[in-house]
Interface confidence: low
Amino acid sequence: QRTDSIPNSPDNVPLKGGNCSEDLLCILKRAPFKKSWAYLQVAKHLNKTKLSWNKDGILHGVRYQDGNLVIQFPGLYFIICQLQFLVQCPNNSVDLKLELLINKHIKKQALVTVCESGMQTKHVYQNLSQFLLDYLQVNTTISVNVDTFQYIDTSTFPLENVLSIFLYSNSD
Amino acid sequence: QRTDSIPNSPDNVPLKGGNCSEDLLCILKRAPFKKSWAYLQVAKHLNKTKLSWNKDGILHGVRYQDGNLVIQFPGLYFIICQLQFLVQCPNNSVDLKLELLINKHIKKQALVTVCESGMQTKHVYQNLSQFLLDYLQVNTTISVNVDTFQYIDTSTFPLENVLSIFLYSNSD
Amino acid sequence: QRTDSIPNSPDNVPLKGGNCSEDLLCILKRAPFKKSWAYLQVAKHLNKTKLSWNKDGILHGVRYQDGNLVIQFPGLYFIICQLQFLVQCPNNSVDLKLELLINKHIKKQALVTVCESGMQTKHVYQNLSQFLLDYLQVNTTISVNVDTFQYIDTSTFPLENVLSIFLYSNSD
């Protein structure tokens, strides 16, 4: 997977003159239509409710630090997280919960109950996703909490558990 | 949360001359790359199958009226709705259904069955989402129907039930 | 539904001079901000694990061939698939799986277990979705595999089973 570094913000680039001179194609390519995105897979070994992610995923205009995506350009972001669970049912139902946090505050969560029959059964699969559309400032952090992180299937399906964002509209 | 009003359509702005004069940065910022979006949370008190939404959410280039999002700029829109249900299982299974309507016609729906063991159990959580990518004209309405609206969890998880859209490509 | 053919790549269009001359609006409309998208519904009759799609859906800058979406412009794509299942429960649980393939390789999958009570019951509905954000080159193929394709509900809910993509950021 490619890891892109973010170019200098086009706002710092003279839009007329300089290397671009009168070349409109060049000018347009340096125009204020920033793009920022990330697509990270969950870390193989999880040991706490705040999930960790593989930082060798796709990162462009966004930093990753200590389980957080850190915003570098302000704007309206589309955020989506999807997790694959694998539960060996005990003799009671299990509630799986995915929490999306912005600056450590829970902004959105998704819940689903599995093993509702209350019987000890073979493994039960469940897929859970959550999205958010929100204005984010520079240095805003995005993270994910899962109480039942031990049920996230990082072994059979390591690629299925992802946190992704993209900048829809910048604040220029 | 911020509520943006839509600026004048850039098509009405002279792209050459006027205030912008020869300033390409100014020109580009008023260029024909419209953005429209909405992110609304469900109303606290639901009393019919057609859901109502809190109009104090994010609205930009889209109007909200009587349970409908109303399109102001034609184009290709990405629409996504997500609902969090909480069901006290009766002694039979329950089908939860989410319908996305465009101009009062059902365009897409998602169904999931809960309480399938047929036993009266504790509360069961279920999360349901639905998306659509469609060309929408000016004044097109978008709404959501849920037969089992009484199971939508507006009390424990008031922020989890959202209808969101964004303009992907305008029709210019 | 509209089917768009892709215009000539704007890179082949002189950005200065030619028909556009000094008309910035014209120039901007032909600027290097490509848009490509697709929204296809599943074919009515499925007979193999690799799903087929109705090619009369929305296609713009993407081709459809033999169950594959074929990329025409390189870039970062958002891909999302959603399927509606209807299962007549046997006397054991059933695992429903949706696999997203890029160039015939499984890139992402979602699983959910239904009929977990192990009882023969009435029909059970389940909705499953999967997304991906990935860099795709020209001629890359996108397809979907479902082992239990016989459970995909193409009769009651023919519009609910979709594969959709859109180009988020081109590679120019």
Partner: antibody, heavy 119, light 106 residues
Framework: RVQLQQSGAELVRPGTSVKISCKAS????????LGWVKQRPGHGLEWIGD????????YSNEKFKGKATLTADESSSTAYMQLSSLTSEDSAVYFC????????????WGAGTTVTVSS | QIVLTQSPAIMSASPGEKVTMTCSAS?????MHWFQQKPGTSPKLWIY???DLASGVPARFSGSGSGTSYSLTISRMEAEDAATYYC?????????FGAGTKLELK
Amino acid sequence: RVQLQQSGAELVRPGTSVKISCKASGYAFTNYWLGWVKQRPGHGLEWIGDIYPGNYNSYSNEKFKGKATLTADESSSTAYMQLSSLTSEDSAVYFCARIYGNYWIFDVWGAGTTVTVSS
Amino acid sequence: QIVLTQSPAIMSASPGEKVTMTCSASSSVNYMHWFQQKPGTSPKLWIYSTSDLASGVPARFSGSGSGTSYSLTISRMEAEDAATYYCQQRSSYPLTFGAGTKLELK
């Protein structure tokens, strides 16, 4: 370093009970399931059950219901298995093993506790 | 419960020889794990989820299979590989192990 330290060998009389321990170190005890496995000469490995110290959830093999009771003490990062109504059939080596995630992969094992039931 | 049958029960191989042992399940399983055990020691995780090598396991080991048939292969036998190997299924409860294949050095 992840380690599971098991209690020493036990010689017990038939009909009595025994409680063996498994002390975890080098990782967050409450974040992983812990399993117990029995090994008798010529009988291979038999799974007894698992416990999740984070919420005391446990699963067990029907064959060992009434025989094995699994508990855990968060404060000392120790898991326990009590074996009751002992017979010669219970003479075996008992291993505790950490379970990776929820995938029932026994990734780290204790050295084993030998239980001998004899009159 | 799912019964796992390992074969052969005992086998011997010379250094450098290719070794294959199998594990057959009484009904279909998703994945298989393998453990190595030497006399007087606890079992060690060797291969997990059918084909992933545990940390420190030499690359000469490999695992494969699906459904009811799984195998462990050593491309070139070495003296240190002499041990008993157990397969274990994780697809349904109770978790079960095979009776083991004892691999001896010829």
